[in-house]
Interface confidence: low
């Protein structure tokens, strides 16, 4: 990657305009604060890619990091990302704004951190203070990053002087959290139960010999305590388990169950929580919409998918025109219902190489002893259009007729066009569309029939030509949602002794 100007640090004037260019052997992109600002991307004749970022009417808020990176999904190597830092000294901007989460620095161990107070001008002197103290702290400052060091649990502010005024930053709070080395995991036999069923939770701690378990759960708040059982998993050393078992759950037992584990030697502790839902009775609920009309294309495979939530696990049946469907031995139909989470299911009907006979009314029914749901839709088989016949005739009336017949589903549209210059048409001259216009001296009559058994439409269109004084190429084009088909016939005047 080549960046112009190369940086790595630039100081630009407020209100000015500045152009950054990045080029590379693959597509490149400029990034600012994890986003891609508007930029012009190009590819040169020699295969080099470039991106030009124009910064207009610069303010202090444009101060910060700019990255040029390859615009693809491959893992970035070190030379695939160039960093540029731009300062725009702006006396109207004191400290650059921080996101709320940057003001609160949570620590889990004694480690070096950075208080990210940054200014727009690299020449400014910046000092760090405890929030309630005037003494500047002896911590190194990097204008691009902030103050880095090991900090106590306190609140801090940065100060600088711009012109003749002293400016304070927002307060930064350093907060040391006690995170234990205890590794706790909580799981439930089921996180959804019906009232009257049992709730059973397990809290497991690894790597400690002496621990204390404390459970918090909805029933405890009302003073109805449940005695957990603690045991050692003998096949795994230092695996201790606490089991909380609530028989015959009530609706009030819904809520958060927390297992808090402490070990007194180092005063370490950890806790994990899990949500349990107690429902009055079982349920089946459809998720998302499935349109009442679905389409499949003839001879292609089509999967119809229904997503739903249910507890307890339901029975799922599919019907076509009120007849139960099952996996066909010929492999034409495949049914599957997958449990994608504890209570979420995906049921799929796959039609392999769809046939016309598979059009019809489909229903999926999911049910158990407490509830049921069903979803129905009509399946239409779309058939690409075919022109079956294009013929020309000379009735006694003196006019000439061309008849075009074709089929397809959904109903095809018919387009007639003609070309008088056979040598140049249709490559050089566009054909003329024909219709019911007297100018073109042609008349059109179209009939549409729906064939129930084949489940497709037939279109028959007759084009009447009043005066054909020289050979004419007439084209019939049929079009529908899944394709188009064209045939062409040459119509010659009555006087000419041949037909093509």
């Amino acid at each position: 990657l080549v960046v112009t100007p190369p940086g790595p640090e630039l100081v630009l004037n407020v209100s000015s305009t500045f152009v950054l260019t990045c080029s590379g052997s693959a597509p490149v992109v400029w990034e600012r604060m994890s986003q891609e600002p508007p930029q012009e991307m190009a590819k040169a004749q020699d295969g080099t890619f470039s991106s030009v970022l124009t910064l207009t009417n610069l303010t202090g808020l444009d101060t910060g990091e700019y990255f040029c990176t390859h615009n693809d999904s491959r893992g970035l190597e070190t030379d695939e990302r160039k960093r540029l830092y731009i300062f725009v000294p702006d006396p109207t901007v004191g400290f650059l704004p921080n996101d709320a989460e940057e003001l609160f620095i949570f620590l889990t161990e004694i480690t070096e951190i950075t208080i990210p107070c940054r200014v727009t001008d690299p020449q400014l002197v910046v000092t760090l203070h405890e929030k309630k103290g005037d003494v500047a702290l002896p911590v190194p400052y990097d204008h691009q990053r902030g103050f880095s060091g090991i900090f106590e649990d306190r609140s801090y502010i940065c100060k600088t002087t711009i012109g003749d005024r002293e400016v304070d930053s927002d307060a930064y709070y350093v907060y040391r959290l006690q995170v234990s080395s205890i590794n706790v995991s909580v799981n439930a036999v089921q996180t959804v139960v019906r009232q009257g069923e049992n709730i059973t939770l397990m809290c497991i701690v690894i790597g400690n010999e002496v621990v204390n378990f404390e459970w918090t759960y909805p029933r405890k708040e009302s003073g109805r305590l449940v005695e957990p059982v603690t045991d050692f998993l003998l096949d795994m050393p230092y695996h201790i388990r606490s089991i909380l078992h609530i028989p015959s759950a009530e609706l009030e037992d819904s809520g958060t169950y927390t297992c808090n584990v402490t070990e007194s030697v180092n005063d370490h502790q950890d806790e994990k929580a899990i949500n349990i839902t107690v429902v009055e009775s079982g349920y089946v609920r459809l998720l998302g919409e499935v349109g009442t009309l679905q389409f499949a294309e003839l001879h292609r495979s089509r999967t119809l998918q229904v997503v739903f939530e249910a507890y307890p696990p339901p029975t799922v049946l599919w019907f076509k025109d009120n007849r139960t469907l099952g996996d066909s031995s010929a492999g034409e139909i495949a049914l599957s219902t997958r449990n994608v989470s504890e209570t979420r299911y995906v049921s799929e009907l796959t039609l392999v190489r769809v046939k016309v006979a598979e059009a019809g009314h489909y229903t999926m029914r999911a049910f158990h002893e407490d509830a049921e749901v069903q979803l129905s839709f009509q399946l239409q088989i779309n058939v690409p259009v075919r022109v079956l016949e294009l013929s020309e005739s000379h009735p006694d009336s003196g006019e000439q007729t061309v008849r075009c017949r074709g089929r397809g589903m959904p109903q095809p549209n018919i387009i007639w066009s003609a070309c008088r210059d056979l040598k140049r048409c249709p490559r050089e001259l566009p054909p003329t569309l024909l219709g019911n216009s007297s100018e073109e001296e042609s008349q059109l009559e179209t009939n549409v029939t729906y064939w129930e058994e084949e489940q497709e439409f037939e279109v028959v269109s007759t084009l009447r030509l009043q005066h054909v004084d020289r050979p004419l190429s007439v084209r019939c084009t049929l079009r529908n949602a899944v394709g188009q088909d064209t045939q062409e016939v040459i119509v010659v005047p009555h006087s000419l002794p041949f037909k093509v």
Epitope: F106, Y173, Y175, T216, T258
Partner: nanobody
């Protein structure tokens, strides 16, 4: 023994404002998280907002963000909930709660001490 006493509830028109107060006593609250919860008739108790006593770091439920504001006055051991643009669905009993582990204030789980609650009714 920790005691929490709420006040400031009442009847207000939709779009109006109320300020709830919670007087905390019985100990110093450094290292505590203080929270407001609410319970509408026939519903579970829901988290509304929390604040850490020492540093004043705040956290809000999505449904009240931008309308409610939590604050504390450590000198007088008070916690406040400023409620603006009130809606009928804000009608509930509002409880003040205290958790001795401030680092947990985002988890909304374990508040060891609770007040008796104050009724807020928003009419349409």
């Amino acid at each position: 023994e920790v005691q929490l006493v709420e006040s400031g509830g009442g009847l207000v028109q939709a779009g109006g404002s109320l300020r709830l107060s919670c007087a905390a006593s019985g100990r110093t609250f450094n290292g505590y998280a203080m929270g407001w919860f609410r319970q509408a008739p026939g519903k579970e108790r829901d988290f509304v907002a929390a604040i850490t006593w020492s540093y004043g770091y705040t956290h809000y439920a999505e449904s009240v963000k931008g309308r409610f504001s939590i604050s504390r006055d450590s000198a007088n051991n008070m916690v406040y909930l400023e409620m603006n643009s009130l809606k009928p669905e804000d009608t509930a009993v509002y409880y003040c709660a205290a958790d001795p582990k401030a680092s947990r204030f985002r988890t909304l789980r374990r508040y060891d001490y609770w007040g008796q609650g104050t009724q807020v009714t928003v009419s349409s």
